[in-house]
């Protein structure tokens, strides 16, 4: 038994860290292999992943980190019984990927303007609270064409859109996601979408 | 083996005082979260307060049923987490759990619990 | 506050069964999602965490599933141990909450 394709980790810089690996064939990750990992500060425990397939070959594990912070260093070991098959360190801090947002709502009755907000997945004392910035994608239901993305490079989770920069009389949808340029993030994942209808009032014609 | 032993339960009158404490032991207490979770007379489980570790500046949280009553607090030297209840409540009565946190949230190892009556 | 809502409060059930216990958030909680097990002594112990990730020791006969708002926890070949309350706990955003709670009896 070989790793492939060795494990790549992500954190969410708060309770997850996400690592992936391949093996050399068709693993049952859970009974065979197990992830070790130990925070390298004085006297600290070792704790244990129980990996889930992902994939024939592939293997998934999340790791419980909290209170992370930006100097913590983790040594991962991943065995099968009593062979190491690799050895390897991890930063979350150097490798993160922010949880994606929530409650993303579309406000229609602001005069001809749409009000998108949502929240801020980290509570207020979370380093990456206030360093967050969001992608918001909105596009039409009916004319795939009809595709935009709206970057906020603000702290407000919040978008303001003129409702006639939009199609009037079709149904929309939009989801966010958040970045954090301090840390090099990855993307989070998309919020889940939401939908509304576009309808907004055409101003008279001037002859 | 990680063992989590709380103390200081008992019966005591509304409007009164009482300080659980919990011993840990069995893993390096001062890098994780602690929290406490109580559970009424025949109810389910609720979540009552949380500090974190000296990384986090032992940043603290707890249920708007609790906050500006109780007061957690940690003494790492002594592996130590204490939860100081004031102005008790009837229905503050129940099991507390003192439970170990891994994860913002995720609690692996809980305590056998302390009983506190109040009436 | 996440509402957390498990709808049956008992389950009966033989030894050897499969069972599966719901539970449901208010609002999307991105898999944040922990099952406890409390046996009748008041013994509470985490089973899984995030939705789908065994804690270490659990016996692999648990196992969780769900996305969004509406997750759940199978428990295949019941053996006598597992007659217990189960809890589900969200941990997406603070204050943390639990289900109700569905007790898990000898049929």
């Known amino acids: 038994m070989k790793v492939l394709q060795e494990p790549t980790c992500v954190s969410d810089y708060m309770s997850i860290s996400t690592c992936e690996w391949k093996m050399n064939g068709p693993t049952n990750c859970s009974t065979e292999l197990r992830l070790l990992y130990q925070l390298v500060f004085l006297l600290s425990e070792a704790h244990t992943c129980i990996p889930e397939n992902n994939g024939g070959a592939g293997c998934v594990c999340h790791l419980l980190m909290d209170d992370v912070v930006s100097a913590d260093n983790y040594t991962l070991d991943l065995w099968a019984g009593q062979q190491l098959l690799w050895k390897g360190s991890f930063k979350p801090s150097e490798h993160v990927k922010p949880r994606a947002p929530g409650n993303l709502t579309v406000h229609t009755n602001v005069s001809d303007t749409l009000l998108l907000t949502w929240s801020n997945p980290y509570p207020p004392d979370n380093y990456l609270y206030n360093h967050l910035t969001y992608a918001v994608n909105i596009w039409s239901e009916n004319d795939p064409a009809d595709f935009r993305i709206y970057n906020v490079t603000y702290l407000e989770p919040s978008l303001r859109i003129a409702a006639s920069t939009l199609k009037s009389g079709i149904s929309y949808r939009a989801r966010v996601r958040a970045w954090a340029q301090c840390y090099n993030t990855t993307w989070s994942e998309w919020s889940p979408s939401t939908k509304w209808h576009n309808s907004y009032r055409e101003p008279f014609e001037q002859h | 083996e990680v063992q989590l032993v709380e103390t200081g339960g008992g019966l005591v009158q509304p409007k009164g005082s009482l300080k659980l404490s919990c011993a840990a032991s069995?893993?390096?207490?001062?890098?994780?979260?602690m929290n406490w979770v109580r559970q009424a007379p025949g109810k389910g489980l609720e979540w009552v307060a949380r500090?974190?570790?000296?990384?986090?500046?032992?940043?603290?949280y707890y249920a708007d049923s609790v906050k500006d009553r109780f007061t957690l607090s940690r003494d790492d030297s002594q592996s130590m987490l204490y939860l100081q209840m004031n102005n008790l409540k009837t229905e503050d009565t129940a099991m507390y759990y003192c439970v170990r946190d891994r994860g913002w949230g995720a609690m692996d190892y809980w305590g056998q619990g302390t009983t506190v009556t109040v009436s | 506050d996440i509402q957390m809502t498990q709808t049956t409060s008992s389950l009966s059930a033989s030894l050897g069964d499969r069972v599966t216990i719901s539970c449901s958030a208010s609002q999307d909680i991105n898999n944040y999602l922990n099952w406890y097990q409390q046996k009748p002594d008041g013994t509470v112990k985490l089973l899984i965490y995030y939705t789908s990730s065994l804690h270490s020791g659990v016996p692999s006969r648990f196992s969780g599933s769900g996305s969004g708002t509406d997750y759940s926890l199978t428990i295949s070949n019941l053996e006598p141990e597992d007659f217990a309350t189960y809890y589900c706990q969200q941990f997406s955003n603070l204050p943390w909450t639990f289900g109700g709670g569905t007790k898990l009896e000898i049929k």
């Open positions: 500090i974190r570790s000296k990384s986090n500046n032992y940043a603290t």
């Open positions: 069995g893993f390096t207490f001062n890098t994780n979260a």
